[in-house]
């Protein structure tokens, strides 16, 4: 039975050109994490394998950095980065757990519009 739960950083609104950290945490299970995949829509961004370490997809190499921990850092954000990101935890013996984070990247003109938020 899958007893674990995934906690995420929560959805993030950020400004174009900035950087943000996406993080997930798997709790309430003793299952062993064998691999964590980070995906956006149907694109694989990065893999963190328990034995082999990190692999960043070639098309994201210059803007995606591994960590902290099992998280992912996205740099030089563009409006095109707006979308849903998935952390997919492959575990044994439980199976797969998935967390969802939506990233909204705003043009500077929109970001300044009437808000009192911390803009990453």
């Amino acid at each position: 039975m899958m007893t674990g739960t995934i906690e995420t950083t929560g959805n993030i609104s950020a400004e174009k050109g900035g950087s943000i950290i996406l993080q997930c945490h798997l709790s309430s299970t003793t299952a062993q994490v064998t691999q964590v995949n980070w995906e956006q829509q149907d694109q694989l961004l990065a893999i963190c394998n328990a034995d082999l370490g990190w692999h960043i997809s070639p098309s994201f190499k210059d803007r995606v950095a591994p960590g902290p921990g099992l998280g992912l850092t996205l740099q030089s954000l563009t409006v095109n980065d707006t979308g849903e990101y998935f952390c997919i935890y492959h575990t044994y013996p439980d199976g797969t757990y998935t967390g969802r984070i939506f990233l909204e990247v705003l043009e500077s003109s929109v970001a300044e519009h009437g808000a009192r938020f911390q803009i990453p």
């Epitope: 950083t9 095109n80 707006t82 969802r100 909204e104």
Partner: antibody
């Protein structure tokens, strides 16, 4: 002035599909997400999901995955939601709403869908 | 999914009253950057819902200052300082911090 103009009421038969349109004006269509919300029985509000008109990226409430499909036509600043395999449970008022910072700033006037044989 | 519980379900008022509506979430709505995506809406009969407050306490443009929002973490409040006839309707809170976004069940503000 920001405006979201939705298509008119629909009466459709069970098992059919239908598409609701939402034409945006008064702002840069690709700069904001477009969200869809269901209101059943004149009370309950449910977030169906959103689309990013800039790149067509979508995010669905899992409850509506396979039921709703979002698309956009950037040339006409119009967002669409197609509802599939309709049943009486899908009878409701559907709203499009412009999103910013995970709130719904401006709403369309709503489209009433009645599913009945 | 995050469960959002709104109280009361119904709120009978007289014009001029001050009222509070509560919204509680099943988990914290603060993201890792300290931003909390909790907003409030008024849905008047025959109209579309309208945004009143976003980010806990920021009044949306054109919203009168008799509306104010407060709270943190899992506990949030909408206050209306002096009820006017145009304030009657259904009030909803919405959390947008966690996927999927979820609404409270609504509070009906009606005349006593």
């Amino acid at each position: 002035e920001v405006q979201l103009q939705q298509s008119g009421p629909e009466l459709v038969k069970p098992g059919a599909s239908m598409k609701i349109s939402c034409k945006a004006s008064g702002y840069s269509f690709t700069g904001y997400t477009m969200n869809w919300v269901k209101q059943s029985h004149g009370k309950n509000l449910e977030w169906i999901g959103l689309i990013n008109p800039y790149n067509g990226g979508t995010s669905y409430n899992q409850k509506f995955k396979g039921k709703a499909t979002f698309t956009v036509d950037k040339s006409s600043s119009t967002a669409y939601m197609e509802l599939l395999s309709l049943t009486s449970e899908d009878s409701a008022v559907y709203y499009c709403a412009r999103g910013l910072r995970f709130s719904l700033e401006y709403w369309g006037q709503g489209t009433t869908l009645t599913v009945s044989s | 999914d995050v469960v959002v519980t709104q109280t009361p379900l119904s709120l009978p008022v007289s014009f001029g009253d001050q009222v509070s509506i509560s919204c509680r979430s099943s988990q914290s709505l603060a993201n890792s950057y300290g931003n909390t995506y909790l907003s409030w809406y008024l849905h008047k009969p025959g109209q579309s819902p309208q945004l009143l407050i976003y980010g806990i306490s920021n009044r949306f443009s054109g919203v009168p200052d008799r509306f104010s929002g407060s709270g943190s973490g899992t506990d949030f409040t909408l206050k209306i300082s002096t009820i006017k006839p145009e304030d009657l309707g259904m009030y909803y809170c919405l959390q947008g911090t966690h996927q999927p976004w979820t609404f409270g069940g609504g509070t009906k503000l009606e005349i006593k």
